[in-house]
């Protein structure tokens, strides 16, 4: 798309090019309205590397509730429904942005924070180290 | 969680209980320093439901670059290294928060936005619908 110069209606800030503190509207716009509402909701049970979801709540963080995946087994479920330890269940992790209240307990002042969350699990071939 | 009284050193805002616009410090605090540095970086190739990662860049979004997973196969890789179509590779999706410049092209004014991203893939048993 075409680059448009800075909007004259922007709020003022000290440094236009590299802001450190910005204004954020917390009325969340959800761009996912057309997606399948079921999404990954039953995959945690049907996967060959099934996982459980654990609730992590922190009132000083926004969003305050994050669900974390923990793989149920070290191995993967085979065609017979048994755990095959020749394969490994591993968490798929993603770095996400959250808002952390700063100073603590302030309702309208935050700092961006990066946290690593486990979203689900996948079954991988193990790395075998051969000893000479 | 426990309600903690509001910090007297908080910046002022019109509505203390339900802020719509808040101040956010963009100096990111990284809480991941003690985690395994490798994270999921090689799982996309070793998984029985391997995926490719596609780069999505949007200068009006923060973070501007997001890498999206796309499953390589409909089926899963079996022990012989072939695709088994009796199983399904499916994306594990997560809703994440990003900041969207609002008004557009403003360097210091954003709105929170929820987007759905595919983080990786997992192998699941298909749901079989039996016709009577």
């Amino acid at each position: 798309g075409i680059t448009i110069p800075r909007n004259p209606g922007c709020p003022n800030s000290e440094d236009k090019n590299f802001p450190r503190t910005v204004m954020v509207n917390l009325n969340i716009h959800n761009r996912n309205t057309n997606t399948n509402p079921k999404r990954s909701s039953d995959y945690y049970n049907r996967s060959t590397s099934p996982w459980n979801l654990h609730r992590n709540e922190d009132p000083e963080r926004y969003p305050s509730v994050i669900w974390e995946a923990k793989c149920r087994h070290l191995g993967c479920i085979n065609a017979d429904g048994n755990v095959d330890y020749h394969m490994n269940s591993v968490p798929i992790q993603q770095e996400i942005l959250v808002l952390r209240r700063e100073p603590p307990h302030c309702p309208n002042s935050f700092r961006l924070e990066k946290i690593l969350v486990s979203v689900g699990c996948t079954c991988v071939t193990p790395i075998v180290h051969h000893v000479a | 969680g426990i309600t903690i009284p509001r910090n007297p050193g908080c910046p002022n805002s019109e509505d203390k209980n339900f802020p719509r616009t808040v101040m956010v410090n963009l100096n990111i605090h990284n809480r991941n320093t003690n985690t395994n540095p490798k994270r999921s970086s090689d799982y996309y190739n070793r998984s029985t439901s391997p995926w490719n990662l596609h780069r999505n860049e949007d200068p009006e979004r923060y973070p501007s670059v997001i890498w999206e997973a796309k499953c390589r196969h409909l089926g899963c890789i079996n022990a012989d290294g072939n695709v088994d179509y009796h199983m399904n590779s499916v994306p594990i999706q997560q809703e994440i928060l990003v900041l969207r410049r609002e008004p557009p092209h403003c360097p210091n004014s954003f709105r929170l936005e929820k987007i759905l991203v595919s983080v990786g893939c997992t192998c699941v048993t298909p749901i079989v619908h039996h016709v009577a």
Epitope: G1, R20 | I28, N30, S41, Y44, P63, W67
Partner: antibody, heavy 123, light 106 residues
Framework: EVQLVQSGAEVKKPGASVKVSCKAS????????VHWVRQAPGQGLEWMGV????????AYNQKFEGRVTMTADTSTSTAYMELRSLRSDDTAVYYC????????????????WGQGTLVTVSS | EIVLTQSPDFQSVTPKEKVTITCSAS?????MHWFQQKPDQSPKLWIY???NLASGVPSRFSGSGSGTDYTLTINSLEAEDAATYYC?????????FGQGTKLEIK
């Protein structure tokens, strides 16, 4: 201090492969992509592709698709670029450069570059 | 791919003179970056996102433009500005650079 230190010059025969390394220091390796750019003698700059060390995601210039592989080892903060089936017109200085994934840390541009690695392809 | 054409290819300039380098894109791009490169050195980020000066770049430099036409301007040339300048787009793959403009001091 941010530094990208590349491996030394290489002389290769046509048809061979070369693997150039780029060791990063002074910043969080997974907060930045590593892009590779080359420059033939007396010529301009040519973008080859990018790797995101955090996810392992890669995007290549189609011109090099099938001949190039970019990898990253987060335990040593090192990125690698391997180019196969070398031809004489691959003779160039190969640069690695970082590109920010997060707003607070960089201007969304290739802001630091390695010193370059000269690869000479000659029979 | 988007082709970036810089003009001029070469310019010999007197100190204190005003210099304008243009970069024309074959399709509209959303931002332009500019790099400075001196002989036997790696490129340096000079101007990012069309008009923002990179750290340490003198204020006599400026950048502007939108769509397909972008400009790097040096208000009052100094001897240390002798270098090759490249424009670069990142709006579509593959990312591309202009062919470069070499500035020489008379």
């Amino acid at each position: 201090e941010v530094q990208l230190v590349q491996s030394g010059a290489e002389v290769k025969k046509p048809g061979a492969s070369v693997k150039v390394s780029c060791k990063a220091s002074g910043y969080t390796f997974t907060d930045y992509e590593v892009h590779w750019v080359r420059q033939a003698p007396g010529q301009g700059l040519e973008w080859m592709g990018v790797i995101d060390p955090g996810t392992g995601g890669v995007a290549y210039n189609q011109k090099f698709e099938g001949r190039v592989t970019m990898t990253a080892d987060t335990s040593t903060s090192t990125a690698y670029m391997e180019l196969r089936s070398l031809r004489s017109d691959d003779t160039a200085v190969y640069y690695c450069t970082r590109y920010s994934l997060f707003y607070g840390s960089s201007p969304y541009a290739m802001d630091y570059w390695g010193q370059g690695t000269l690869v000479t392809v000659s029979s | 791919e988007i082709v970036l054409t810089q003009s001029p290819d070469f310019q010999s300039v007197t100190p204190k003179e005003k210099v304008t380098i243009t970069c024309s894109a074959s399709s509209s791009v959303n931002y332009m970056h500019w790099f400075q490169q001196k002989p036997d050195q790696s490129p340096k980020l000079w101007i990012y996102r069309t008009s923002n000066l990179a750290s340490g770049v003198p204020s006599r430099f400026s950048g502007s433009g939108s769509g397909t036409d972008y400009t790097l301007t040096i208000n009052s040339l100094e001897a240390e500005d002798a270098a090759t300048y490249y424009c670069q787009q990142r709006s579509s793959y593959p990312w591309t650079f202009g062919q470069g403009t070499k500035l020489e001091i008379k």
